[in-house]
Amino acid sequence: KSSNEATNITPKHNMKAFLDELKAENIKKFLYNFTQIPHLAGTEQNFQLAKQIQSQWKEFGLDSVELAHYDVLLSYPNKTHPNYISIINEDGNEIFNTSLFEPPPPGYENVSDIVPPFSAFSPQGMPEGDLVYVNYARTEDFFKLERDMKINCSGKIVIARYGKVFRGNKVKNAQLAGAKGVILYSDPADYFAPGVKSYPDGWNLPGGGVQRGNILNLNGAGDPLTPGYPANEYAYRRGIAEAVGLPSIPVHPIGYYDAQKLLEKMGGSAPPDSSWRGSLKVPYNVGPGFTGNFSTQKVKMHIHSTNEVTRIYNVIGTLRGAVEPDRYVILGGHRDSWVFGGIDPQSGAAVVHEIVRSFGTLKKEGWRPRRTILFASWDAEEFGLLGSTEWAEENSRLLQERGVAYINADSSIEGNYTLRVDCTPLMYSLVHNLTKELKSPDEGFEGKSLYESWTKKSPSPEFSGMPRISKLGSGNDFEVFFQRLGIASGRARYTKNWETNKFSGYPLYHSVYETYELVEKFYDPMFKYHLTVAQVRGGMVFELANSIVLPFDCRDYAVVLRKYADKIYSISMKHPQEMKTYSVSFDSLFSAVKNFTEIASKFSERLQDFDKSNPIVLRMMNDQLMFLERAFIDPLGLPDRPFYRHVIYAPSSHNKYAGESFPGIYDALFDIESKVDPSKAWGEVKRQIYVAAFTVQAAAETLSEVA
């Protein structure tokens, strides 16, 4: 049988039939269904939703749908002993207390089991002391405080505004600075777009709204008690003292009304510059401590949350491939939410649900994809990407041999301005070609392609006439697949206009106000942006699973490798004297990139010309494409981050959300001028150049003619 016969419908009609079956009204209906009650990881409500999704995916026509459960470390507030922060006077009396909960949104007043705002995995504690305002608590903010302003955070409680970087990095930085507690808050400068009403009248954050979130520094480990291995029935668990990535100091989040009360009394040093000022009507003094009249008052934290080993459930659906059933294309997104999950994750889960329904409809008509498609509804993403990571750990041997691609499907929207895509360079051409075939949903672009509106609104900084595609970082469920296993990965969603909206993420992120109504009233009333995201995600999965030759272009990797090599070289060249002193050369890396470029070019020529009717040669060429991403994996991992094994990309050591290129070299060079032993530090730079050059050369050789 030819591959076309096996899939029963002509290739062009396949994709069109799949896309035509996707309906905005269904996504809307699914979103409503998924957002009526909270679905916190580890709760009965989320288990029930898992079973509902399992049942519906079976009805939609998947071959099998199973629950995969794991017992992982989660964190919850104490129901009888709430977390809060006080201002105390010299007698220890509490003269101000922060809110214990967010005021519920209209229509949700009687909903039970709304978890109050908390920082997941915070240890218990009741530290008291002077406050220091640390801006965003980024690495550079602590450099400014400690090196320029000579402010010592040791023994202080720090208050940091959310935004710019992952909250776990903020906590890690505060710990390293010696702080004994961290208060996180949402400043209106970052979470309130001027001119828009706060919820329920608009999509802005009200003063009582608070962002929940985990504060782990897992570096890809998954369950903190079982790093590297699945948290199954016979797992050996570490003691809590040896758990991976747990914070050592109490942490708690608050809204800007409460933050105003803490910040308005701040004394000490003035903010170093305007970048340290938010939009509250307070001076943004750094401290330490309160001003004049209030100098005897202190801040006290009361944190009583507990860490508990709890059962979680992934839903794994399979649509078996007709021709290459042992090749897996995975579409996965999480199901667990902090509260209602109106955007995160259910705007993504509703899209996955509709994609499954469309594939199921085609399958019921006799069609099958060429390759196997796996669909996943992950649990406990909000607690550190736990569900996806445990499943990948359990199935790592299968995945590393059979995994073609992973497409992530968390929140479908974070705005309604234009498309946003982060993916491996192997998928650039796939994304470009697909978006040229899809209609833009944007006003003013009627009858135009998605590619056109995307390129106009979000142009590539390097290539004119092309859209921006970003590097993969982390903070979502693709992490284990891409950063640990080296499976080509991508993600797509609709986003805001980053030029005009400087706030971080979307204002109501991880708050109780992330409801169905938020989406239906303010972000996407017609669900046209959700439909477009479904078409992009689903279209990518379709092409990856069904195209005869995998839709990967290795030449695009060559282009970015040269760009990344140029970038890291220019960073190193800020230290010309040391490079000379310690004989640091990037020649090996540039040579390897040159070789990769030439070999990739020749491989692409062969890809055009080979006999596609020969199944052995076809499989061989496809395997070279599939395993190219794998070839960038270093089995030893990055220094001190064994589960980040991709040599070309890793989450930034300073911001988990951001991707860094040549991370081993980058980290070796970072702040190198402050290292106590320059010879050792530059030796590590040289070692990392060696590792990178070897890896690029080795990857290039996987694309050479096999004999």
Partner: antibody
């Protein structure tokens, strides 16, 4: 359409009183803070007073405290400024203005809708 | 009270010119700043809020920037209807205060 129509200006002797009115239409008056802003002849703008949506909070510039009273009647969609013990330096065009809560704190952000202005002259 | 100063106090310009007006606050006001245009005998009109956000219906040739204490209003290409007096206003703390104004007239 959204508008503010003013009345009540005129000539008054020093020490005298005057009441300015401002009628709102085209928007939900009770949802907005309201203000009075004045402009002396040939001079710049000076904020005079603010009043909260329900009238529970009022703020004044120091120079009018104890002499001027801002008030509102939400049922009539009207804003008032009662001016007592008037002085020559109170001579100005008085504008009523809607406070636009473009940011999280609605107590005094920007003035997006203005009345046409009414002249108050304090002279003997 | 927060004192607002503007410079220049007046500027003569021609149609098509780029005009920049600066406003300085006596203390940091974050982005709590608005800009107004006033023509003789008329009420002021809101142009810019939150230091850089363009009010609905205002032409895009007007733009605002700045944060903290220093702010700028820019008219990228002056049009005949733009000849007027421009005021900045802080809303960081009571009392709300305005700058003294900058008059833009025909060269």
């Amino acid at each position: 359409q959204v508008q503010l129509v003013q009345s009540g200006g005129g000539l008054v002797q020093p020490g005298g009183s005057l009441r300015l009115s401002c009628a709102a239409s085209g928007f939900t008056f009770s949802s907005y803070w309201m203000s009075w802003v004045r402009q002396a002849p040939g001079k710049g703008l000076e904020w005079v007073a603010n009043i909260k949506q329900d009238g529970s909070e009022k703020y004044y510039v120091d120079s009018v405290k104890g002499r001027f009273t801002i008030s509102r009647d939400n049922a009539k969609n009207s804003l008032y400024l009662q001016m007592n013990s008037l002085r020559a330096e109170d001579t100005a065009v008085y504008y009523c203005a809607r406070v636009w809560d473009y940011y999280y704190d609605s107590s005094g952000d920007a003035f997006d809708i203005w009345g046409q202005g009414t002249m108050v002259t304090v002279s003997s | 009270d927060i004192v607002m100063t503007q410079s220049p106090s007046s500027v003569s310009a021609s149609v098509g010119d780029r005009v920049t007006i600066t406003c300085r606050a006596s203390q940091a006001i974050s982005s709590w700043l608005a800009w107004y245009q006033q023509k003789p005998g008329k009420a002021p009109k809101l142009l810019i809020y939150a230091a850089s956000s363009l009010q609905s219906g205002v032409p895009s040739r007007f733009s605002g920037s700045g944060s903290g204490t220093d702010f700028t209003l820019t008219i990228s290409s002056l049009q005949p209807e733009d000849f007027a007096t421009y005021y900045c206003q802080q809303a960081y703390s009571f009392p709300v205060t305005f700058g003294p104004g900058t008059k833009v007239d025909i060269k």
